[in-house]
């Protein structure tokens, strides 16, 4: 988790002088509770936005937006703590809005936004906005949280972001898998425009099970430049096991931008349809 490298993060708006600070996610008001604390944020919304760095790279960011409740507690609102927690790693990053002037009621509801948390493809986050100071130990909570799922690199807008392009998102191998006679599969895919090797991983499963009955890896050496964008055809021999009939073919490239962590593409071959066996006709007619 990190912040987009913008020159200065701003939270000021007409009628409010405000600055954005790094935060340890442990605001002082936890340790030194105050008697009077503001109410919780209202209408917290998290959306996927995209932003360029100063270097011109494009990153997905969490666009966080919330409003204030129209009660007198805004007189005691000193700022907000924004926290983003990546759920699979428990990594957390926080920033603090520090209000340098007192809020006053005005004709419009106060609205705040922040769009500088860089998020990763195919990851889930919990976003929390805490109004400051935080409540006393038995006080009503004054935060709001929402989960936010970032699409993977198949998503049209995500595909052209720097992290997705670095992991090979622009490569479309257009995999085809064909079942041949004598327990073989023919795999065909389009090579990318880089002289790098590929792995084909074949995993076979019984019809209705998820525990594999066969696994095979085939290595494809780096193509020559004249082979870039050409189709590569590979014939894989299957293990002749009864019922080991559902095959998943994964292709893993080793592009220089992502090495061992490039996006894999896969295709699946289902077990052949079993013809419905007609009810056997009895060779005698029961009498009853």
């Amino acid at each position: 988790l990190r912040l987009l490298d913008h020159r200065a993060l701003v939270c000021s708006q007409p009628g409010l002088n405000c600055t954005v600070k790094n935060s340890t996610c442990l605001d002082d008001s936890w340790i030194h509770p105050r008697n009077l604390t503001p109410s919780s944020p209202k209408d917290l919304q998290i959306q996927l936005h995209f932003a360029h760095t100063q270097q011109g790279d494009l990153f997905p960011v969490a666009h966080i937006e919330w409003t204030l409740q129209t009660d007198a507690s805004i007189l005691y609102l000193e700022g907000a703590e924004l926290s983003v927690l990546q759920l699979n790693t428990n990594e957390r990053l926080c920033v603090r809005f520090e209000f340098l002037s007192k809020l006053r009621h005005h004709h419009r509801r106060w609205r705040f936004t922040f769009s500088h948390f860089v998020v990763d493809p195919d990851q889930e986050y919990e976003v929390t906005v805490h109004h400051l100071p935080k409540p006393i130990p038995d006080g009503d909570p004054n935060h709001q949280s929402k989960n936010f799922l970032v699409p993977d690199c198949e998503h049209a807008r995500m595909k052209v972001t720097t992290p997705c392009m670095s992991s090979g998102s622009l490569w479309d191998p257009n995999i085809t898998v064909e079942t041949l006679e004598a327990h073989q599969l023919r795999v065909s895919f389009t090579l990318w425009n880089e002289s790098t090797h590929y792995q084909i991983l074949l995993t076979s499963f019984p019809h209705m099970e998820n525990h594999s009955c066969f696994e095979h890896m085939h290595h494809i050496p780096a193509p020559r430049p004249e082979e870039f964008h050409q189709r590569s055809n590979v014939t894989l021999t299957l293990r002749n096991l009864k019922g080991c009939c559902r095959h998943q073919v994964q292709i893993q490239p080793f592009f220089s931008s992502c090495l061992n962590d490039c996006l894999r593409h896969s295709a699946t071959v289902s077990c052949p349809e079993m013809p419905d066996t007609p009810e056997p006709i009895p060779d005698y007619m029961p009498l009853w």
Epitope: Q199, L201, T203, H211, S212, F214, E215, H216, M217, T237, R239, Q250, Q252, N260, D261
Partner: nanobody
Framework: EVQLVESGGGLVQPGGSLRLSCAAS????????VAWYRQAPGKQRDFVAT???????TYTESVKGRFTISRDNAKGTVYLQVNRLKPEDTAVYIC???????WGQGTQVTVSS
């Protein structure tokens, strides 16, 4: 924690032999195809050999007849027997389980007189 650990590397004279081992923790190695790669200093990682769950093996052309990949499912280990070593075989030898995209740290093989 899921990890691969290679061992058995060392300094050997040309024509010598070594037996490299790859052991896994956190996964059942016998359920997976396993590959060996090697990487010489300043070079790309190169494929060496692979063994599938049925025990079928494949080798890169330069090691055919000299290297043998095998597996002991009871011990949960995959071996690479390297014979008739040449100076150009000097590299870090790395074990790989493709289905988990799992890579070991490697074991150094140096062939020098």
């Amino acid at each position: 924690e899921v990890q691969l650990v290679e061992s058995g590397g060392g300094l050997v004279q040309p024509g010598g032999s070594l037996r490299l081992s790859c052991a896994a923790s956190g996964i059942i190695l016998s359920d997976n195809a396993v590959a060996w790669y090697r990487q010489a200093p300043g070079k790309q990682r190169d494929f060496v050999a692979t063994i599938n769950t049925a025990g079928w093996t494949t080798y890169t052309e330069s090691v055919k007849g000299r290297f043998t990949i095998s597996r002991d499912n009871a011990k949960g280990t995959v071996y690479l027997q390297v014979n008739r070593l040449k100076p150009e075989d000097t590299a870090v030898y790395i074990c790989n389980v493709p289905s988990y995209n799992l890579w070991g740290q490697g074991t150094q093989v140096t062939v020098s007189s």
